[in-house]
């Protein structure tokens, strides 16, 4: 495998990662599908530092992030542990609100306009950020 | 210049297999994802596969899903299709495409090769 | 996935008319809509990204319009070279990308 050193074009760097934040809305799996395009993930929170960088970058608009329980449990989309990990919800989130009328509950996190976080129904077309670790080999499977 | 030139087509028998290449030359190969479109005879654009640059991550058309395996060689500036259980609906031009993403999220096939023809018959 | 439907599936014109192609997806993909040119026997060629931005080298008599689920192609003046068939294609949810049928401008 390749190692990534610095980042993309159009990318910004901070604390040896690399972010990438649209100018335009997609629902949950979409902007999901089109980060790991980029060979990257949805942004995954591990720190109140990280936290105050994404919401600087994003500004007062609903943004995606990596965090869902469309399957159950709740999961950050690289592994990381969500139960001992850094969290960030507005109070009495996540709710799971089924009011909504679209169908179904509430399964993906994104950013609000505060920066606080709440679960919303996945196919809402917000932006999205992605992000990918400097220093870490991508995986370049063997060919058949 | 930007080029895809693709290679490997040919006539198969139902059930059969086929390896098709895009060389790619004219640009930072290892940095783009890359996709497969087909065109059956007479008919429209279908999206087959896509591979992202470091070849971590790919996607399938729900026809091709389970048969077809798209890879790459970023050494070779080179992209690959190993097309099995080939079936007679398969007959096709394959294309390969480069994705070009713009700033604010869209993306699109911005150059392609010359295509090449999968004909699959008894 | 989102379908997407051209119209009309055929057209006869002439030089130096001012032609329309539009195209319809089954749900909204804001303006994820791009537009391909594919003359025969030849791949395809990208015409129009993200609605309305001309990809480079495309003249400028070809502009795309519209938003949400409705979208058109518009050839403000025809000329020979631009006989051909048309594509859109969405990129909102994608993979996988999903095209048209594709429109064919025939001479008349």
């Known amino acids: 495998g390749s190692e990534r050193t610095c980042c993309p074009v159009n990318w910004v760097e901070h604390e040896r990662s690399c972010y990438w934040f649209s100018r335009s809305g997609k629902a949950w799996a979409d902007a999901d599908n089109y980060c790991r395009l980029e060979d990257a993930h949805l942004v995954v929170v591990t720190s109140w530092e990280e936290q105050k960088f994404v919401q600087h970058h994003i500004g007062p608009v609903n943004t995606w992030m990596g965090l869902h329980d469309q399957n159950g449990p709740w999961k950050w989309v690289d592994g990381t542990d969500y139960e001992t990990g850094f969290k960030n919800w507005r109070p009495e989130q996540p709710d799971d609100w089924y009011g909504h009328g679209l169908g179904g509950g509430e399964d993906c996190a994104h950013f609000t306009d505060d920066g606080r976080w709440n679960d919303d129904v996945c196919q809402r077309p917000y932006r999205w950020v992605c992000e990918t670790e400097l220093d870490k080999a991508s995986q370049e499977p063997p060919l058949l | 210049e930007v080029q895809l030139l693709e290679s490997g087509g040919g006539l198969v028998q139902p059930g059969g297999s086929l390896r098709l290449s895009c060389a790619a030359s004219g640009f930072t190969f290892s940095s783009y994802a890359m996709s497969w479109v087909r065109q059956a005879p007479g008919k429209g654009l279908e999206w087959v596969s896509v591979?992202?640059?470091?070849?971590?991550?790919?996607f399938y058309g729900d026809s091709v899903k389970g048969r077809f395996t798209i890879s790459r060689d970023n050494s070779k500036n080179t992209l690959y299709l190993q097309m099995n259980s080939l079936r007679a609906e398969d007959t096709a031009i394959y294309y390969c495409?480069?994705?070009?993403?713009?700033?604010?999220?869209?993306?699109?096939?911005?150059?392609w090769g010359q295509g090449t023809m999968v004909t699959v018959s008894s | 996935d989102i379908q997407m439907t051209q119209s009309p599936s055929s057209l006869s014109a002439s030089v130096g008319d001012r032609v329309n192609i539009t195209c319809r997806a089954s749900h909204s993909i804001s303006n994820y809509l791009n537009w391909y040119q594919q003359k025969a026997g030849k791949a395809p060629n990208l015409l129009i990204y993200?609605?309305?931005n001309l990809q480079s080298g495309v003249p400028s008599r070809f502009s795309g319009s519209g938003s949400g689920t409705d979208f058109t192609l518009t050839i403000s003046s025809l000329q020979p070279e631009d006989f051909a068939t048309y594509y859109c294609?969405?990129?909102?949810?994608?993979?996988?990308?999903?095209f048209g049928q594709g429109t064919k401008v025939e001479i008349k």
């Open positions: 294609q969405q990129s909102y949810s994608s993979p996988p990308w999903t």
């Open positions: 993200t609605t309305l």
């Open positions: 495409a480069k994705r070009e993403t713009y700033d604010w999220g869209s993306d699109a096939f911005d150059i």
């Open positions: 591979i992202s640059g470091s070849g971590g991550n790919t």
